[in-house]
């Protein structure tokens, strides 16, 4: 039904030339190139080298971006499903390759990998039953979502499932576990003394990544997990359900993977690309797979399961959603229904399947060996109206605009790489495999990565998550862009953004958040230490408490959802294109990289204060085990002073001296890299950034000084306090060393 592509597909295998021919040609070409490159570099001034004329500046690039084109591209990308590993998504990859070539990129290649994906069984559907004492099924959950009008005859709509769930038919009493967060299980197990061992747990979606929910349930001893969307989280008051509004109907279900990969990429080839000669682990040794069956349902079906719940009452109002059910915790059903059980029927399969990235190159005129990357995924769960195609359509228009400038004779100073990633929904697989394959190039040449998944998750204001190195770039760029918001006509994007999403620390400035994970920047930032950022339009978090947007990963995420309810004029999409495209333009074209290391100094101090305050909740233990943060604060102080001096030198140095310019830019480029610990974080070898990592309790959220944070987490419950506080001290020393070492990369080189 989903026309899977397997590793045997040889249609895209490339012809090989004799190696000696390639090598000889390279030596000759390389020699001439080097001579010409050096000659050209020394005789040109920096401004001439980047070929910036009034016609070919950022304004020309931004003016070329058109809302109408983004709309057209979105429509084109959303007419059929583009599930990873399917023929339809391969065809879309080839279409994008062809169009990027037409737009004018120097080269556009498909790169394929054979990775572990997961699909429902076509003849044996997944569902959940309520069974009576005789084992008869008296209620079954839905087999698919009611298709939206106009899409009834579309084939290959994958039914809702939890990707990578193992097969199984567990049967037992139900326990309601709220959001299945770490603190929810603490409440259940420690305060309420409810044991989930041998039980099927039902958890509501929201607050944290679904994979963390499943991991927590597994650790609690559950035999299965049911995930559901509660109207409290996925139905905004006063808004109609799709197709009459943007809310989730009762039959709508959120798909998604439930892996705990911790940055590994393909579960069978951690650390290495899943290519033809890759060694693959057995399924039992695969990284991050869940061990218990998991299945998602909508709130109509959840109502049927929850309305019969007995046992303990919910501990407080934070455990109650909006359904007309008691939200009892269980275990099991109440009085009359106590003999009834819940049974899961999960028959999904995991299989090695071929995926395709599209990689486009626009070669830099002056520093072709410095890469600025704009990447977003192409694969969707169904139509992908928002996720990912609202992002892919923006990337497409950015490529078109850059291509137009190139056709007029312009080139960026640095090389720009454009990527359409595959299999993001299955664990960030396409981007991670490509980065694994190209890690040596990327760690030496990667200047920045800008992510481009969904352009919108609302239409209220801008949302940016990025490295502190990019703060000033984002502030300066948004001051130059016009706000699309009603009531801010003629005002800057910076102004509307600051008004609607103020920084909690600095008045008159907008909020910028930490990078977490759950998207394709992960490998670039958390593993490789390449400065990264992301931007999209978002909802009003003050008034809209629902998690993500209501129709996330459902069949109702259509073109019409965007065109009718979110962005009829595509003005928010255009603004996001200007922000993402503008960042790429500046990163690729500025003579001096637009990074400000002083902003890292500011946040390092803030993060050191925060982790110190967490530790100070245990003053007696800190005294007993001689735990001190003095060294960390000293390193942060050193970083601040060295960053300040570096910034002065950066302001004053001779920018017409290409060697000096390259030297200063390299210090800026490699600063993010300096925060990488080659050994990685404890039990998370692919999360190597010492300042930031995805939270161990929620992959979507970023945590600062994660090594120290995790060592301190729930430390009062550790059986061996001496060992636990020893680990805190070890993590403080690692953080101290890393901050000091990073500072020294900014020192004057001689």
């Amino acid at each position: 039904m989903w026309n899977l592509l397997h590793e045997t597909d040889s249609a895209v295998a490339t012809a090989r030339r004799p190696r000696w021919l390639c090598a000889g040609a390279l030596v000759l070409a390389g020699g001439f190139f080097l001579l010409g490159f050096l000659f050209g570099w020394f005789i040109k001034s920096s401004s001439e080298a980047t070929n910036i004329t009034p016609k070919h500046n950022m304004k020309a690039f931004l003016d070329e971006l058109k809302a109408e084109n983004i709309k057209k591209f979105l429509h084109n990308f959303t007419q059929i499903p583009h599930l990873a590993g399917t023929e339809q998504n391969f065809q879309l990859a080839k279409q994008i390759q062809s169009q990027w070539k037409e737009f004018g990129l120097d080269s556009v290649e498909l790169t394929h990998y054979d990775v572990l994906l997961s699909y429902p069984n076509k003849t044996h559907p997944n569902y959940i039953s309520i069974i009576n004492e005789d084992g008869n099924e008296i209620f079954n959950t839905s087999l698919f979502e009611p298709p939206p009008a106009g899409y009834e005859n579309v084939s290959d709509i994958v039914p809702p499932f939890s990707a990578f769930s193992p097969q199984g038919m567990p049967e037992g009493d139900l326990v309601y576990v709220n959001y299945a967060r770490t603190e929810d299980f603490f409440k259940l197990e420690r305060d309420m003394k409810i044991n989930c061992s041998g039980k099927i747990v039902i958890a509501r979606y929201g607050k944290v990544f679904r994979g963390n929910k499943v991991k927590n349930a597994q650790l609690a001893g559950a035999t299965g997990v049911i995930l559901y969307s509660d109207p409290a989280d996925y139905f905004a008051p006063g808004v109609k359900s799709y197709p009459d509004g943007w809310n989730l109907p009762g039959g709508g279900v959120q798909r998604g993977n439930i892996l705990n990969l911790n940055g590994a990429g393909d579960p069978l080839t951690p650390g290495y690309p899943a290519n033809e000669y890759a060694y693959r682990r057995g399924i039992a040794e695969a990284v991050g797979l869940p061990s218990i069956p998991v299945h998602p349902i909508g709130y109509y079906d959840a109502q049927k399961l929850l309305e019969k719940m007995g046992g303990s009452a919910s501990p407080d109002s934070s455990w109650r959603g909006s359904l007309k059910v008691p939200y009892n915790v269980g275990p099991g059903f109440t009085g009359n229904f106590s003999t009834q059980k819940v049974k899961m029927h999960i028959h999904s399969t995991s299989e090695v399947t071929r995926i395709y990235n599209v990689i486009g190159t626009l070669r830099g005129a002056v520093e072709p060996d410095r890469y600025v990357i704009l990447g977003g995924h192409r694969d969707s769960w169904v139509f992908g109206g928002i996720d990912p195609q609202s992002g892919a359509a923006v990337v497409h228009e950015i490529v078109r605009s850059f291509g137009t400038l190139k056709k007029e004779g312009w080139r960026p100073r640095r090389t720009i790489l454009f990527a359409s990633w595959d299999a993001e929904e299955f664990g960030l697989l396409g981007s991670t495999e490509w980065a694994e394959e190209n890690s040596r190039l990327l760690q030496e040449r990667g200047v920045a990565y800008i992510n481009a998944d969904s352009s919108i998750e609302g239409n209220y204001t801008l949302r940016v998550d990025c490295t502190p190195l990019m703060y000033s770039l984002v502030y300066n760029l948004t001051k130059e862009l016009e706000s699309p918001d009603e009531g801010f006509e003629g005002k800057s994007l910076y102004e509307s953004w600051t008004k609607k999403s103020p920084s909690p620390e600095f008045s008159g400035m907008p909020r910028i958040s930490k990078l977490g994970s759950g998207n394709d920047f992960e490998v670039f930032f958390q593993r490789l230490g390449i400065a990264s950022g992301r931007a999209r339009y978002t909802k009003n978090w003050e008034t809209n408490k629902f998690s993500s947007y209501p129709l996330y990963h459902s069949v109702y995420e259509t073109y019409e959802l965007v065109e009718k309810f979110y962005d009829p004029m595509f003005k928010y999409h255009l603004t996001v294109a200007q922000v993402r495209g503008g960042m790429v333009f500046e990163l690729a074209n500025s003579v001096v990289l637009p990074f400000d290391c002083r902003d890292y100094a500011v946040v390092l101090r803030k993060y050191a204060d925060k982790i110190y305050n967490i530790s100070m909740k245990h003053p007696q233990e800190m005294k007993t085990y001689s735990v001190s943060f003095d060294s960390l604060f000293s390193a942060v102080k050193n970083f601040t002073e060295i960053a300040s001096k570096f910034s002065e030198r950066l302001r004053d140095f001779d920018k017409s001296n290409p060697i000096l310019l390259r030297m200063m830019n390299d210090q800026l480029m490699f600063l993010e890299r300096a925060f990488i610990d080659p050994l990685g974080l404890p039990d998370r070898p692919f999360y190597r950034h010492v300042i930031y990592a995805p939270s161990s309790h929620n992959k979507y959220a970023g945590e600062s000084f994660p090594g120290i944070y995790d060592a301190l987490f729930d430390i009062e419950s550790k059986v061996d306090p001496s060992q636990a506080w020893g680990e805190v001290k070890r993590q403080i020393s690692i953080a101290t060393f890393t901050v000091q070492a990073a500072a020294e990369t900014l020192s004057e080189v001689a």
Partner: nanobody
Framework: EVQLVESGGGVVQPGRSLRLSCAAS????????THWVRQAPGKGLEWVAY????????YYAAPVKGRFTISRDNSKNTLYLQMNSLRAEDTAVYYC????????????????????WGQGTMVTVSS
Amino acid sequence: EVQLVESGGGVVQPGRSLRLSCAASGFSFSGYGTHWVRQAPGKGLEWVAYISYDGSNKYYAAPVKGRFTISRDNSKNTLYLQMNSLRAEDTAVYYCAKDAAWGLRLGESSSYDFDIWGQGTMVTVSS
């Protein structure tokens, strides 16, 4: 035009079987639960069976449970009622009806709400 058209009725002997069909058009069939309802001569309407939009749940009135089977083929926009072990008291005009609520999956104890009916097909069980 939104319509439901039943077929397959006729005269049949007690103990025999009959299969009714209902062809739907003009609406998103795969998004709506559907029902069979009957009216015996001189009597009021009696609900017979319900099937959810996706076919996962089927509910039956007590007099027909174990003898009748409701099914659907969404690819053909068709609803079926397989009637086995027919009895004289099954004699009635059988109507298919569309549930009023899109995407709703009703339970056994729900109160059903129909908004579109077919013209009916007569089933006579007689020796």
